[in-house]
Amino acid sequence: DPESSIFIEDAIKYFKEKVSTQNLLLLLTDNEAWNGFVAAAELPRNEADELRKALDNLARQMIMKDKNWHDKGQQYRNWFLKEFPRLKSELEDNIRRLRALADGVQKVHKGTTIANVVSGSLSISSGILTLVGMGLAPFTEGGSLVLLEPGMELGITAALTGITSSTMDYGKKWWTQAQAHDLVIKSLDKLKEVREFLGENISNFLSLAGNTYQLTRGIGKDIRALRRARANLQSVPHASASRPRVTEPISAESGEQVERVNEPSILEMSRGVKLTDVAPVSFFLVLDVVYLVYESKHLHEGAKSETAEELKKVAQELEEKLNILNNNYKILQADQEL
């Protein structure tokens, strides 16, 4: 069936780009994981068998290509186990600070700008590497805070013209549009540097299987979306004879699949840093744009609730990230004790 083989091709492309060697092996060696995946993907038996064969081949290729993936993974796991307690403490500091900002609590030193209250809280230290891995890159350039998601290098620059980041005036300090522009550009440069430094290694570090059920269900849902989208494309009258490249299936519970066709994927945008695992368990939970830029909102009655809500949202994002990291830390600790 040509339709089925086109779907298998798309599925393999997805696994190549989005699933780590370790998680692919988990899927292929754990029957429960495989069955969970097949169920979540709603694959008919014949397609499941065909995909299984193709994935067996892919796994062999991946292992051949990266013989020391296991060692590298272990190396990054050890690094994470060592660094996490300190990072956890830093993240908790950040969460507390963001909550205090949201509540509008006065900081001891007079004339402190909100920006300065946050600066230092997300310090540029070795912890930044993990924060990039979590999907949040923090920067305190110029005393203000910007949180950027991986793969945003391209999209943001275009939007910069419309951005003013006057942060929030608390001590009569103003941030001009030019400074904001400069701040974001510098932050993007730093983000690129860090990402290039991490390179492919990030995928080994991040391939922590974690919750098998979540993992298989997550991949399954993406494959299901991809399969439905393929079916929808086939049913469109006058569809182009040449097959369009489907890069990013958008998982949705409803049947309304919005496919992005012929666009560079986030994977391609993020300069060789491979997204591993899938959304439910990945540290690379790709957020919509998570960065703090304020349009000269004052901490007075007018914009108080608006800015408070923004800050609470950022705090919540950090809390979610910390929970994911915490869970992975526990899993890794338990693995080590076995």
Partner: antibody
Framework: QIQLVQSGPDLKKPGETVKISCRTS????????VNWVKQAPGKGLKWMGW????????TYAEEFRGRFAISLETSASTAFLTISNLKNEDSATYFC??????????????WGQGTTLTVSS | DIQMTQSPDSLSASVGETVTITCGAS??????LNWYQRKQGKSPQLLIY???NLADGMSSRFSGSRSGRQYSLKISSLHPDDVATYYC?????????FGGGTKLEIK
């Protein structure tokens, strides 16, 4: 030295209004928030709300929204708690306390001596 | 709102003993927890802030610790002067709720 001095005990009738003052000294008033805490006889502490002495922004705990208002007289370094339409259950000792935030943690480091309010017909 | 559950409600111990009071938060408060001491007829006094930091002027016999959402206040080598009611407080976000209090008595 740092001090928060509250107004004296008060006896009021239900339906009346009371305004409790908290005069501060020994520190820069507008650098620290002021919060209010209630303790009914035989009960624990209840956080009522606070005021940002710099901006005048207030936040109240759910059960203290409506009849309770926290205000300032910055020139006199004084915070006020006003309770209107008094009820018998408002009988309690009310404390004002300085809210300190050092960039890491928030706490109430200096407290007033407390104001005992009795509401009785 | 974040709920703070303190235990025990009351306890009685002898001079020189070590006692521990615990406080649980209904959600993660990331170490933003304070302990206050309120002696009979006096205003509350800050004892511990940020779960583990001893407030200025307080005896080092008091110490705070944290394990996940559970927080503890340890009073070692109990003194008669420690007779008071102890309260924990969420200091992460408003409202800054208090625990129900633990009344400490000397046997």
């Amino acid at each position: 030295q740092i001090q928060l001095v509250q107004s004296g005990p008060d006896l009021k009738k239900p339906g009346e209004t009371v305004k409790i003052s908290c005069r501060t000294s020994g520190y820069a008033f507008t650098n620290y928030g002021v919060n209010w805490v209630k303790q009914a006889p035989g009960k624990g502490l209840k956080w009522m709300g606070w005021i940002n002495t710099n901006t005048g922004q207030t936040t109240y705990a759910e059960e203290f929204r409506g009849r309770f208002a926290i205000s300032l007289e910055t020139s006199a370094s004084t915070a006020f708690l006003t309770i209107s339409n008094l009820k018998n259950e408002d009988s309690a000792t009310y404390f004002c306390a300085r809210l300190i935030y050092d960039g890491d943690y928030i706490s109430s480091d200096f407290w007033g001596q407390g104001t005992t309010l009795t509401v009785s017909s | 709102d974040i709920q703070m559950t303190q235990s025990p409600d009351s306890l009685s111990a002898s001079v020189g003993e070590t006692v521990t009071i615990t406080c649980g938060a209904s959600e993660n408060i990331y170490g933003a927890l304070n302990w206050y001491q309120r002696k009979q007829g006096k205003s509350p006094q800050l004892l511990i802030y940020g779960a583990t930091n001893l407030a200025d002027g307080m005896s080092s016999r008091f110490s705070g610790s944290r394990s996940g959402r559970q927080y503890s206040l340890k009073i070692s080598s109990l003194h008669p002067d420690d007779v008071a009611t102890y309260y924990c407080q969420n200091a992460l976000s408003m409202p800054y709720t208090f625990g129900g209090g633990t009344k400490l008595e000397i046997k």
